[in-house]
Interface confidence: low
């Protein structure tokens, strides 16, 4: 069972349902309308924003656009058909794909990634497919909070 519990707090971005708890014994607590998985919290948007707008929204929630640790990180979203902005963009300065925190993309995460013609920002879906798009395109997005 994934470590998860819902926390009865009201996040800044919405007057979300004030859900009562039967608190699990495990380690994770997530705001309402956030999803807990493997001791991380994810906000999976239903609205669309540009990559920068998405990044700013996540920052306002004390989180960041999703930085994938491995390709199965979004297994819990297997039923979703949508592409979502993640925290990966192309740095002209470094001629490399960098995560929001400045770290480089692992060659093992997307083995065929070098065949992409960079369009600056990356959208990702739960099937493990990555799509490079103009950062001004509006997509859904995923924010991630690491709890431990």
């Amino acid at each position: 069972k994934n470590s998860f519990t819902k926390l009865s707090v009201e996040p800044a971005y919405t007057p979300g349902p004030n859900i009562e708890l039967q608190k699990d014994s495990d380690c994770c607590s997530c705001h309402e309308k956030w999803v807990g998985y493997r001791c991380n919290c994810y906000f999976i948007s239903s609205e669309e924003k540009t990559w920068n707008e998405s990044r700013h929204f996540c920052a306002s929630q004390k989180s960041s656009l999703l930085q994938l640790q491995n390709r199965d990180e979004l297994d819990f979203m297997s039923s979703s058909q949508h592409f979502y902005w993640i925290g990966l963009s192309y740095s002209e300065e470094h001629t490399a794909w960098l995560w929001e925190n400045g770290s480089a993309l692992s060659q093992y995460l997307f083995p065929s990634f070098e065949t992409f013609k960079p369009k600056n920002c990356i959208a990702y879906n739960s099937k493990g497919n990555a799509l490079d798009e103009s950062c001004e395109t509006k997509n859904r997005y995923i924010c991630k909070q690491q709890l431990i």
Epitope: T14, G16, N18, I19, Q22, K33, W34, S46, F76, S80
Partner: antibody, heavy 121, light 107 residues
Framework: QVQLQQSGPGLVKPSETLSLTCTVS??????????WGWIRQPPGKGLEWIGS???????YYNPSLKSRVTISVDTSKNQFSLNLSSVTAADTAVYYC?????????????WGQGTMVTVSS | EIVLTQSPATLSLSPGERATLSCRAS??????LAWFQQKPGQAPRLLIY???SRATGIPDRFSGSGSGTDFTLTISRLEPEDFAVYYC?????????FGQGTRLEIK
């Protein structure tokens, strides 16, 4: 695609406990992006949310019914259940189970077929 | 709890006409509002979530608008199968609540 199949008695005696079960097919009840809920509708009236449950067992209930409601989940059987104790004629209604996504929408998107429950001696 | 008031209680229109249904919340629910359609003997069907996003498979003649406390469901051109009862539901604050419904009937 996901479907919800309800089962349980259609007649319950006053003061007894109403018990209904909702079986999820075409998907896993253990998906972490869904809550599962119960809603009821008295004859000729509107909808009333009863409560919801997460696969981990976390629940939240309508305060107006909280003292009498227990919702439980059995992940091994891919089903969740409603128990409503000390029923009266006012609990006569069609009871629905439904899925509540956590992917931004947070609105009941898939419903069971409904079970008409009559409280009568 | 947040009370949702729907108006009118009954709306009588003819096929091909435009229907406008209103839902007013007793306090702000942001855009956490959904609309459902229910036909006799059937379970409700989700039409709109997030005040304005159409659910999967819902025809584009259905549209939702509004935020805060005032919301509208519009059916641009009524089809015979659209005559039913419509409910709004808020999920911005617990407990989740529904409006009392608007019956859309054939004139």
């Amino acid at each position: 695609q996901v479907q919800l199949q309800q089962s349980g008695p259609g007649l319950v005696k006053p003061s007894e406990t109403l018990s209904l079960t909702c079986t999820v097919s075409g998907g896993s009840i253990s998906s972490i992006i869904y809550y599962w809920g119960w809603i009821r509708q008295p004859p000729g009236k509107g909808l009333e949310w009863i409560g919801s449950i997460y696969y981990s067992g976390s629940t939240y209930y309508n305060p107006s019914l909280k003292s009498r409601v227990t919702i439980s989940v059995d992940t091994s059987k891919n089903q969740f259940s409603l128990n409503l104790s000390s029923v009266t004629a006012a609990d006569t209604a069609v009871y629905y189970c439904a899925r509540l996504p956590l992917t931004g929408e947070f609105a009941f998107d898939i419903w069971g077929q409904g079970t008409m429950v009559t409280v009568s001696s | 709890e947040i009370v949702l008031t729907q108006s009118p209680a009954t709306l009588s229109l003819s096929p091909g006409e435009r229907a406008t249904l209103s839902c007013r919340a007793s306090q702000s629910v942001s855009t956490y509002l959904a609309w459902f359609q229910q036909k006799p003997g059937q379970a409700p069907r989700l039409l709109i979530y997030g005040a304005s996003s159409r659910a999967t498979g819902i025809p584009d003649r259905f549209s939702g608008s509004g935020s805060g406390t005032d919301f509208t469901l519009t059916i641009s051109r009524l089809e015979p199968e659209d005559f039913a009862v419509y409910y709004c539901q808020q999920y911005g604050s617990s407990p989740i609540t529904f409006g009392q419904g608007t019956r859309l009937e054939i004139k």
